[in-house]
C-alpha cells in the first residue's frame, strides 16, 4: 500500500510542535504536538520520550510504566494514586514526573 | 507550594560536629531526591551529596567519610558533618534534585572560626 | 574525578547583546544531555534556567538557550537585558554507580556594560 505525501502509516506518530507552557511556577510543562495514525484500540501516547500508538487501557487505567517510559536500564515505579512515574537510574537517582 | 528550609547553621570551632537539616514541603521526599550543595564566601557552588527514598546516599568523593545524609522524616533530611575545619566555612544549601536542582532553599551559613 | 570546565570565567556585554558561555565535562553527562544551567544573584540561591542540556525551566526567558550533548555544552544569552548581571554555573549529572552524582562548573560572571 503506497502512502500519499503527509499522510501517516498505521500505528505510527510523526511531532508537528514542541512549545512550552510556563503559566505555573516551579513547573515546567512542555506541549508536544504530534500527529498519529493510530489503529483501533490504540491512543496517540508516548514511548521512550517519543509520540507513539500505544494501547488505550494503558493510559485510560493509567498504567505508565507499560508505555516504556525511562531509558533502557532504568527502573520504572508508578507514583500513589497513578498521579505519574518514577524512573530510578543503576546508581538509584530517580527522576519523578507527574500527570496533571 | 514546592518549598525547602535549611536550618543549623552556627558559628562553630574546628573539629566540631554539626547537623543541618533540610525541611521541604509542597512535596514528598518519597518521591523526589534531595541534594545537599554548599558555597564558600565568594566562591562557586559544590555539591556534597544526593539521597533518594529508599536508596544509599551518594557523596562527592572529597566529603566521603566526614559527611553523613539522612532522610530523618517524611518532610526532612539531615547532613551531618563531622571534625569541621575553618575550609567547611561556607553557606549549605539543599535542593529538590530531579530534572535540575529546583526549587533550592535560601541556604543556612556554617561559619568554622577558632 | 569528574569535571566541568566553564569558560570564560568572567565575561562582559553590552545591553541588547549577545552572550555565550561554554562547559566542558571530562566525562559525558548522563544519557548525553543530563546537564542544567542555573543563574545566581549576591545573597540568593541559585535558579535554574535550562535542564537536560537545551528545556527551558519555567518562567524563564526564552532569550536563554542551551545546547550541545555529550561533553560539550553552551548556555547562550541574546539580547542581554541589566538583570542578567549574575554568575553562571552548569551542573552535569553522572551514573552515581560508577562516579559522583553531580559536578559544578566553576562559574562564569556576567557584567553589563
Known amino acids: 500500500q503506497f502512502l500519499k505525501e503527509g499522510q501517516l502509516a498505521a500505528g505510527t506518530c510523526e511531532i508537528v510542535t514542541l512549545d512550552r507552557d510556563s503559566s505555573q511556577p516551579r513547573r515546567t510543562i512542555a506541549r508536544q504536538t504530534a500527529r498519529c495514525a493510530c489503529r483501533k484500540g490504540q491512543i496517540a501516547g508516548t514511548t521512550r520520550a517519543r509520540p507513539a500508538c500505544v494501547d488505550a487501557r494503558i493510559i485510560l487505567q493509567r498504567w505508565w510504566c507499560q508505555m516504556e517510559l525511562c531509558l533502557e536500564g532504568e527502573g520504572c515505579d508508578l507514583l500513589i494514586n497513578r498521579s505519574g512515574w518514577t524512573c530510578t537510574q543503576p546508581g538509584g537517582r530517580i527522576k519523578t514526573t507527574t500527570v496533571s | 507550594q514546592e518549598q525547602l528550609v535549611e536550618s543549623g547553621g552556627r558559628l562553630v570551632t574546628p573539629g566540631t560536629t554539626l547537623t543541618l537539616t533540610c525541611t521541604v514541603s509542597?512535596?514528598?521526599?518519597?518521591?523526589?531526591?534531595v541534594s545537599w550543595v554548599r558555597q564558600a564566601p565568594g566562591k562557586g557552588l559544590e555539591w556534597i551529596g544526593y539521597?533518594?527514598?529508599?536508596?544509599?546516599p551518594h557523596y562527592a568523593s572529597w566529603a566521603k567519610g566526614r559527611f553523613t545524609i539522612s532522610k530523618t522524616s517524611s518532610t526532612t533530611v539531615d547532613l551531618k558533618m563531622t571534625s569541621l575545619t575553618t575550609e567547611d566555612t561556607a553557606t549549605y544549601f539543599c535542593?529538590?534534585?530531579?530534572?535540575?536542582?529546583?526549587?533550592w532553599g535560601p541556604g543556612t551559613l556554617v561559619t568554622v572560626s577558632s | 574525578e569528574l569535571d566541568l570546565t566553564q569558560t570564560p570565567s568572567s565575561v562582559s556585554a553590552a545591553v541588547g547583546g549577545t552572550v555565550t558561555i561554554n562547559c566542558q565535562a571530562s566525562?559525558?553527562?548522563?544519557?548525553?544531555?543530563?546537564l542544567a544551567w542555573y543563574q545566581q544573584k549576591p545573597g540568593q540561591p541559585p535558579k535554574l534556567l535550562i535542564y537536560?542540556?537545551?528545556t527551558l525551566a519555567s518562567g524563564v526567558s526564552s532569550r536563554f538557550k542551551g545546547s550541545g550533548s555529550g561533553t560539550q555544552f553552551t548556555l547562550t544569552i541574546s539580547d542581554v537585558q541589566c538583570d542578567d548581571a549574575a554568575t553562571y554555573y552548569c551542573?552535569?549529572?553522572?551514573?552515581?554507580?560508577?562516579?559522583?552524582?553531580?559536578?559544578f562548573g566553576g562559574g562564569t560572571e556576567l557584567e553589563i556594560l
Open positions: 535542593a529538590r534534585d530531579n530534572y535540575g536542582m529546583d526549587p
Open positions: 509542597g512535596f514528598s521526599l518519597s518521591s523526589y531526591g
Open positions: 539521597i533518594a527514598n529508599n536508596y544509599n
Open positions: 566525562q559525558s553527562v548522563y544519557n548525553n544531555k543530563n
Open positions: 537536560a542540556a537545551s
Open positions: 551542573q552535569g549529572e553522572f551514573s552515581c554507580s560508577s562516579a559522583d552524582c553531580n559536578a
